[in-house]
């Protein structure tokens, strides 16, 4: 039998001799050189030959691990008289021994790694790996090892996994923010004769709300005139923060002051400026100077950098306000006045005053536009703002008269107002009832005695305070003998009744009823109305069918039914 | 001239057994490892397994360890490949190459490929 | 162990030089070869050992190793060199490896 071990081989020798792999063997061999060896397979004859005596292989040349890590060759044993095989042909294998020429590289030539300010030491910051192409499984020409080269004192990396972490505490961004860190790689477990290689690491800390807001100045001072409307700008103010995007973002508030109610600061996101704007009218008779304190704060805060103090800081502001030479200003917004229709001319209604609110106190003069009140029924005495009449009033010709006063300085006709006044003419009972409508109504010839022929109704251009209240009755001269009687309902209305059984329209073909309505206020107003009321020919149901010669209108309702 | 000849592919169940054969002719078969290779449909080639000349050696792919097995009958110029337990993922054309020595042991020839589908 | 990346696909015009890349950790300490594969066919070996052609190969084809780059050099590419094409290596002990292979389109 075959009498060998697994043969090995270190690759990439370098001497001047072939290498000794190892020796074919067979207990047959007496040692007599009768048995001949025979090497085949794998690279055999080139890469490896064999002393067919004595069974020694030697490599040749020189070889890469790399190339094939595994050479299966086949070996024979021949007796050389008779050339027949004394071992069975068998395979072999040579390992090819890595011997470490390989240095460790790195996946990146420049790993680029952020990690926070601020941040606990041992905080992981990226994690750098080194491969090595030498066998892992022989020796330690693969096993790596890292250490750091360039980075100290502020970072370390394990040695084991490449794991890159913070070394230093409070690593402050606003202080410096870019750090290049060198990490070796370096292999037989980072001995002596090891190969090593080396990567770049940009390392950059990320901003932390690690600063508060600043005011460069505890006072600022602005103008502004009184006229400025709500919503103007008066000024900005800016705080200025070492941290940057989220964590320098500031927002403006009004804490404190007389000013509180008066003025507002707005955050301007992209300067990120305080903006000083009027809240309320100003009014520089009433206040010249305000003062207000403003708090710039970051609206984001880390709890744990709390300790550092507050993240807000706050200055004065100081507000001139500017006098404007200001119109007159009414002592209302609108005037209403009343008046009864029956005033006579120069009837006084009432007055409107109005001051220059400016300190000068200029004299004011009154009047009427005239494109409000283009009939001229109305005046006004421009020294004391007195309104009176010009003209007659008539109530149900108009109930309301909208005119506008304009107040004028004296000294600056420039400056002006105008005011509304909403004139309201009073009733006075001044116009007597009267029929609704026309009544020319109809009475059947064979009509009994008080059969309601016709309902009557008034209207009164008046408006008394307590409503109408009308009476109705025959006029004195037809209130004797009459053929027909007035009725009062005692609502406004009368109805028209027969006096007498049967009518002859030959004989008396129209009657007319004088009616007098009277109103119930004071003055009392009265009018007397005429009724028609023709005689007709009715069928039995009491429908008309026909009257004397002339044609009747006949409204509907006329019919006097039962 | 140099020729490897493929065979036995077919439709099997997941689960089932495929035997492959691989006829080599106008070369001394005797005298070179073999490998099997496989390509999934759409896909790029994979190693599947080896066995050396005289089939002392053997070594597999980890996807098919324990499942496959690589033999050669050099008196019959053949190579072989047992597939039991067979999975969907198996599914492939598989070819036969020889590795040759001359061309710094690479692949050449390579047979013409055998489909081998395993489906339900 | 080695690991073979190649881009998925390359083009080239007809005359023009294609050049398909094979990448790994320190890829010249490993012997790599190049096979070539068309449409429904097999795998056939243009290159082997990094830079050596086969005989029945075509001059054209070449190949190169440096650094964690091996290159197969297709040079005035011709359309009937449209196929894909695998750079392959020995990997630990028996084991074999191939890339992912590039698909090669002659515009």
């Known amino acids: 039998s075959w009498m060998w071990n697994q043969f090995f081989l270190l690759e990439e020798y370098t001497g001047s001799d072939y290498q000794y792999v190892g020796k074919l063997h067979s207990d047959q061999d007496r040692g007599d050189g009768s048995l001949k060896y025979i090497l085949s397979g794998d690279g055999a004859g080139d890469l490896f030959i064999i002393n067919e005596n004595t069974g020694d292989i030697q490599a040749t040349k020189r070889l890469d691990r790399e190339e094939k890590p595994v050479y299966i060759l086949r070996a024979q044993a021949i007796n050389r008289r008779t050339g027949r095989p004394v071992e069975p042909e068998s395979e072999f294998i040579i390992k090819i021994h890595d011997i470490n020429d390989n240095e460790p590289i790195f996946t990146k030539e420049v790993y680029t790694a952020t990690v926070p300010e601020m941040s606990d030491v041992g905080t992981f910051v990226v994690q750098v790996t080194a491969t090595d192409a030498d066998d892992p499984t022989y020796g330690n020409s693969a096993k790596v090892v890292y250490s750091i080269l360039q980075g100290q004192p502020y970072f370390s990396v394990e040695s084991e996994t490449g794991i890159i972490k913070t070394a230093l505490l409070n690593m402050d961004r606003e202080n410096r923010e870019q750090y290049q860190v060198v990490i070796q790689a370096k292999d037989m477990g980072g001995q002596m004769g090891g190969l090593s290689g080396t990567t770049t690491v940009n390392i950059t800390l990320t901003d932390v709300n690690d600063n508060p807001p600043r005011f460069p100045q505890s006072t600022y001072q602005f103008k502004t005139p009184e006229s400025s409307p709500p919503g103007t700008p008066i000024g900005r103010i800016k705080a200025s923060d070492a941290d940057v995007g989220e964590n320098a973002e500031i927002e403006y508030s009004i804490t404190d002051g007389e000013g509180l109610d008066m003025f507002d600061v707005i955050t301007d996101q992209e300067t990120q400026e305080g903006i000083i704007t009027v809240k309320k009218l100003l009014d520089f008779e009433k206040k010249k100077v305000y003062t207000l304190k403003v708090e710039a704060s970051n609206p984001y805060v880390e709890p744990r950098f709390l300790y550092l103090g507050p993240f807000k800081d706050s200055a004065t502001v100081r507000i001139v306000v500017e006098d404007v030479d200001e119109p007159p200003v009414f002592s209302k917004l609108a005037y209403i006045l009343q008046i009864r229709e029956d005033a006579q001319i120069n009837t006084t209604i009432g007055s409107v005053t109005a001051q220059d609110p400016d300190a000068a106190r200029n004299p004011v003069k009154y009047s009427v536009d005239r494109h409000t009140d283009m009939d001229r029924i109305f005046n006004i005495d421009s020294g004391n703002g007195s309104i009176f009449t010009s003209k007659l009033l008539d109530r149900e010709t108009l109930l309301w008269h909208n005119i506008t006063v304009i107040a004028t300085e004296i000294n600056n006709p420039k400056q002006s107002s105008r005011v509304p006044l909403y004139i309201k003419v009073l009733d006075v009972n001044d116009n007597a009832p009267e029929f609704a409508e026309f009544y020319e109504t109809f009475v059947c010839e064979k009509a009994k005695a008080d059969q309601l022929i016709q309902t009557l109704h008034a209207v009164d251009k008046d408006d008394p305070y307590s409503g109408h209240q009308f009476s109705f009755s025959l006029a004195p001269e037809a209130a004797s003998g009459s053929n027909f009687t007035i009725q009062d309902n005692k609502d406004n209305t009368a109805g028209i009744l027969t006096r007498k059984n049967g009518y002859n329209r030959h004989e008396m073909s129209t009657y007319l009823l004088p009616v007098v309505i009277s109103d119930n206020d004071y003055p009392v107003q009265s009018s007397t109305g005429t009724v028609t009321v023709r005689v007709c020919a009715c069928d039995h149901h009491g429908n008309m069918q026909s009257c004397h010669a002339e044609a009747l209108i006949h409204p509907t309702g006329l019919s006097t039914g039962a | 001239q140099v020729q490897l000849l493929e065979s036995g592919g077919g439709l099997v169940q997941p689960g089932g057994s495929l035997r492959l054969s691989c006829a080599a002719s106008?070369?001394?078969?005797?005298?070179?490892?073999m490998h099997w290779v496989r390509q999934a449909p759409g896909k790029g080639l994979e190693w599947v397994s080896f066995?050396?000349?005289?089939?002392?050696?053997?070594y597999y792919a980890d996807s098919v360890k324990g499942r496959f097995t690589i033999s050669r009958d050099n008196s019959k110029n053949t190579l072989y490949l047992q597939m039991n337990s067979l999975r969907a993922e198996d599914t492939a054309v598989y070819y036969c190459?020889?590795?040759?020595?001359?061309?710094?042991?690479?692949?050449?020839?390579w047979g013409q490929g055998t489909l081998v589908t395993v489906s339900s | 162990d080695i690991e073979l990346t190649q881009p998925p696909s390359v083009s080239v015009s007809p005359g023009q030089t294609a050049s398909i890349t094979c990448s790994g950790d320190n890829i010249r300490k490993y012997v790599v070869h190049w096979y070539q594969q068309k449409p429904g066919q097999a795998p056939v070996l243009v290159i082997y050992?990094?830079?050596n052609r086969p005989s029945g190969i075509p001059e054209r084809f070449s190949g190169s190793n440096s650094g964690n780059t091996a290159t197969l050099t297709i040079s005035g590419t011709q359309a009937e060199d449209e196929a894909d094409y695998y750079c392959q290596s020995w990997d630990s002990f028996l084991a074999v490896v191939f890339g992912g292979g590039t698909k090669l389109t002659v515009l």
């Open positions: 190459a020889r590795e040759t020595a001359g061309y710094g042991y690479a692949f050449d020839p």
């Open positions: 106008g070369f001394t078969f005797s005298s070179y490892a």
């Open positions: 066995i050396s000349s005289l089939g002392s050696y053997t």
């Open positions: 050992r990094d830079n």
